[in-house]
């Protein structure tokens, strides 16, 4: 009997109102044995995956994913999903990426370091669970 | 299908250098940690060192056996996989295998390649 | 560094035993252990990861249990290309060290 996979969760370090050049890394978790991560931009058309996985704990594994300089079109709405055989995982929440101009004062709206960034998490649409993982052969226009 | 070539073992004198390559194809390697194990005639396996993708800015791992004097390194233009091999011992005598990192897990290895550090 | 004990270092069994060989880590590592088969001349092989997960193309005669620090590899019927070497490994923290590996002979 295939096991229940537990949804992803992500987070952006160091927050998520990230200043324009600055960089961003998404952090996507889940189960040990994952397989392949992949961090989806607003809809599954535009997409990042990795085999990259370490432990986050005795019971999780995480994939990292780093925008070196982001950019006014790195803004938008982001979520996780993962490839565990036989089978991939709901998506996760939303997180939505801000890109601002430049540093701003005390009352920048800036996330705590280390956030999943609270409010500016969305609820995931699940109603699709049909992806192949892009390294055996299915590609996407990357996130960067 | 999944291939990983070692090449550049050989023979070696006590604190001479050897460079090993390997190979990768039939997978997306620049997604993919990278290792090298290696197991010395009628021994077991030794984890050698290991290299992260670009999301975790290439970190490098090693054994304390070969820190310092090991330098494990990749070209993602080229596929490709080098362990630099300095100051070699003769207990550094052994097959070294290119093995790829998949879930945290050694799912792929190459046939290996000999070392051989002998005066 | 996370040890890892295995037990027994070589058995002698027959075609259609059942065989159980055993990992023990030195600290909890939860699930983070592989099981490789290796044998003569030949590069290892992933049989389990996470503990429990069987790799791809891997017959289901071969089966992986425990977490924390208790593990066990079972082959439910052996069979006479299972003869070979396996080894444990943890991958929860570098070192990423290896079991002394086990071999399983003809009886």
């Known amino acids: 009997q295939e096991e229940d996979l537990p949804r992803p969760s992500i987070s952006a370090e160091p927050g998520t109102v990230i200043p324009l050049g600055s960089h961003v890394t998404f952090v996507c978790r889940g189960p040990v044995g994952v397989q392949t991560f992949r961090l989806e931009r607003d809809s599954r058309s535009t997409y990042n995956d990795t085999e990259d996985v370490s432990q986050a704990s005795p019971s999780e594994s995480e994939a990292r994913f780093r925008i070196d300089s982001v950019r006014e079109g790195n803004a938008g709405l982001y979520r996780c999903i993962y490839y565990k055989p036989p089978k991939w995982s709901e998506q996760s929440d939303y997180l939505e990426l801000l890109v601002k101009e430049s540093s701003g004062g005390p009352d920048s709206p800036d996330t705590e370091p280390g956030s999943s960034a609270g409010p500016t998490q969305r609820p995931s649409d699940n109603s699709h669970n049909e992806h192949a993982p892009a390294s055996q052969g299915l590609k996407a226009e990357h996130l960067y | 299908e999944v291939q990983l070539v070692e090449s550049g073992g050989g023979l070696v004198q006590p604190g001479g250098s050897l460079r090993l390559s390997c190979a990768a194809s039939?997978?997306?390697?620049?997604?993919?940690?990278m290792n090298w194990v290696r197991q010395a005639p009628g021994k077991g396996l030794e984890w050698v060192a290991r290299?992260?993708?670009?999301?975790?800015?290439?970190?490098?791992f090693y054994a304390d056996s070969v820190k310092d004097r090991f330098t494990i390194s990749r070209d993602d233009s080229k596929n490709s996989l080098y362990l630099q091999m300095n100051s070699l011992k003769t207990e550094d005598t052994a097959v070294y295998y290119c093995?790829?990192?998949?879930?945290?897990?050694?799912?792929?290895w190459g046939q290996g390649t000999t070392v051989t550090v002998s005066s | 560094d996370i040890q890892m004990t295995q037990s027994p270092s070589s058995l002698s069994a027959s075609v259609g035993d059942r065989v159980t060989i055993t990992c023990l880590a030195s600290?909890?590592?939860?699930?983070?252990l592989g099981w490789y088969q290796q044998k003569p001349g030949k590069a290892p092989k992933l049989l389990i990861y996470a503990a429990t997960s069987l790799a791809e193309g891997v017959p289901s005669r071969f089966s992986g249990s425990g977490s924390g620090t208790d593990f066990t590899l079972t082959i439910s019927s052996l069979q006479p290309e299972d003869f070979a070497t396996y080894y444990c490994?943890?991958?929860?923290?570098?070192?990423?060290?290896f079991g002394g590996g086990t071999k399983v002979e003809i009886k």
């Open positions: 093995v790829r990192d998949r879930a945290g897990f050694f799912a792929y």
């Open positions: 600290q909890t590592i939860g699930t983070w």
């Open positions: 290299i992260r993708t670009k999301n975790y800015n290439y970190a490098t």
């Open positions: 039939g997978f997306t390697f620049n997604i993919n940690a």
């Open positions: 490994q943890q991958l929860y923290s570098t070192p990423l060290t």
